[in-house]
């Protein structure tokens, strides 16, 4: 989606992204020749971010605000190439990606946050839910993890059956070009999944089937 357009404004960066970028630059200065273990580096950054005070985070939040303003300004004048606005074909009958344990937890506690802080932005609600999840003991996370695992299992069966049948409309519409490599296909599916989860965030939680799990 517009990945190839060099004129497209660079996406806006979050305060955490700016922080990570700064960490990376610091690391490069200190160890110019060292190769970075990405997962270890990410973990260290995340730990540092968690312990930082609001004051310390402030400068990164200011950078993010400025970048958001830049992005919005540039997007106003940006004209996408023809056909670019069209979303990738998504079969409405395809099984929906299962929610994560954290997502299930959010569905449960979002009313609490919204009820106590009615004016909170979506981002701040998410932040508070993240804090709550971090404060939830492993024992209390278990029911959500169990349910998420159950839903994941079901999804894997459903997606296997769905793929076995073949994406129905896709072939008819001539969307399927040459056979893509498995890796490329998986990457695209992951992207779709991420989109699905973002869309699901906004959906009401009412249709969530409940397990009467004994803890």
């Amino acid at each position: 989606m517009g990945k190839g357009d060099p004129k497209k404004p660079r996406g806006k960066m979050s305060s955490y992204a700016f922080f990570v970028q700064t960490c990376r630059e610091e690391h490069k200065k200190k160890h110019p020749d060292a190769s970075v273990n990405f997962s270890e580096f990410s973990k260290k950054c995340s730990e540092r971010w968690k312990t930082m005070s609001a004051k310390e985070k402030g400068k990164f939040e200011d950078m993010a605000k400025a970048d958001k303003a830049r992005y919005e300004r540039e997007m106003k004048t940006y004209i996408p190439p023809k056909g670019e606005t069209k979303k990738k074909f998504k079969d409405p009958n395809a099984p929906k990606r299962p929610p994560s344990a954290f997502f299930l937890f959010c569905s449960e506690y979002r009313p609490k946050i919204k009820g106590e802080h009615p004016g909170l932005s979506i981002g701040d609600v998410a932040k508070k839910l993240g804090e709550m999840w971090n404060n939830t003991a492993a024992d209390d996370k278990q029911p959500y993890e169990k349910k998420a695992a159950k839903l994941k299992e079901k999804y894997e069966k459903d997606i296997a059956a769905y793929r076995a049948k073949g994406k129905p409309d896709a072939a008819k519409k001539g969307v399927v070009k040459a056979e893509k490599s498995k890796k490329k296909k998986e990457e695209e599916e992951d992207e779709e999944d991420e989109e699905d989860e973002e869309e699901e965030e906004d959906e009401e939680d009412e249709d969530e089937e409940e397990d009467d799990d004994d803890e």
Epitope: K112, E116, A137
Partner: antibody, heavy 120, light 113 residues
Framework: EVQLLESGGGLVQPGGSLRLSCAAS????????MVWVRQAPGKGLEWVSR????????GYADSVKGRFTISRDNSKNTLYLQMNSLRAEDTAVYYC?????????????WGQGTMVTVSS | DIQMTQSPDSLAVSLGERATINCKSS????????????LAWYQQKPGQPPKLLIY???TRESGVPDRFSGSGSGTDFTLTISSLQAEDVAVYYC?????????FGQGTKVEIK
């Protein structure tokens, strides 16, 4: 004002049933874990049961498992405890409490309690 | 289940003196992921429901006088009343919320000497 008010206690014979209610007000009931805690006369506190905000997850003390059922009606801001096959050792003051789930898990708001006496 | 044991069972302290209550859990209630102790302290006065005093082992609930303080980590915890007042006469309970079932200590009765 944040408040919890229990009702439904009373005298019941061994083997009998009772349904306790707890009416919540002053907070977003549907966003909180709720619990029942009991206290036998002259004794300490005993956790009985808990229920998740949506009602999908429940937990019970071994002493009441299979006999007691916790439930909630978020549209009525009410918590329930259905007590069946009651025994003399179930005699206690039953408190409903709000569990500050996710924020700190402790029981921060308590009702005044309702007395349940199981005796023939 | 995590067992909670309080000591002493009862305590008589002069007004203005320090009162110390201990609580021991049968296993650690410290969650390594966030370095928090899942332990609370409650005060119960005769004929009243319990009242939350301390959570996270050492964080005072809002409105609780600062003469009440909590300390400890892992399995050993302490509630201290720095200068006992007449209105502090009550039974004090520790409680773990690290795992289900939630469990309470047997209680410590604080009286005035």
């Amino acid at each position: 004002e944040v408040q919890l008010l229990e009702s439904g206690g009373g005298l019941v014979q061994p083997g009998g049933s009772l349904r306790l209610s707890c009416a919540a007000s002053g907070f977003t009931f549907s966003g909180y874990m709720m619990v029942w805690v009991r206290q036998a006369p002259g004794k300490g506190l005993e956790w009985v049961s808990r229920i998740s905000p949506s009602g999908g997850q429940t937990g019970y003390a071994d002493s009441v498992k299979g006999r007691f059922t916790i439930s909630r009606d978020n549209s009525k801001n009410t918590l329930y405890l259905q007590m069946n096959s009651l025994r003399a050792e179930d005699t206690a003051v039953y408190y409903c409490a709000r569990e500050e789930g996710g924020s700190y898990g402790a029981f921060d708001i308590w009702g005044q309690g309702t007395m349940v006496t199981v005796s023939s | 289940d995590i067992q909670m044991t309080q000591s002493p069972d009862s305590l008589a302290v002069s007004l203005g003196e320090r009162a110390t209550i201990n609580c021991k859990s049968s296993q650690s209630v410290l969650y390594s992921s966030n370095n928090k102790n899942y332990l609370a302290w409650y005060q119960q006065k005769p004929g009243q429901p319990p009242k939350l005093l301390i959570y996270w082992a050492s964080t005072r609930e809002s409105g609780v006088p600062d003469r009440f303080s909590g300390s400890g980590s892992g399995t050993d915890f302490t509630l201290t009343i720095s200068s006992l007042q007449a209105e502090d006469v009550a039974v004090y309970y520790c409680q773990q919320y690290y795992s289900t079932p939630r469990t309470f200590g047997q209680g410590t009765k604080v009286e005035i000497k």
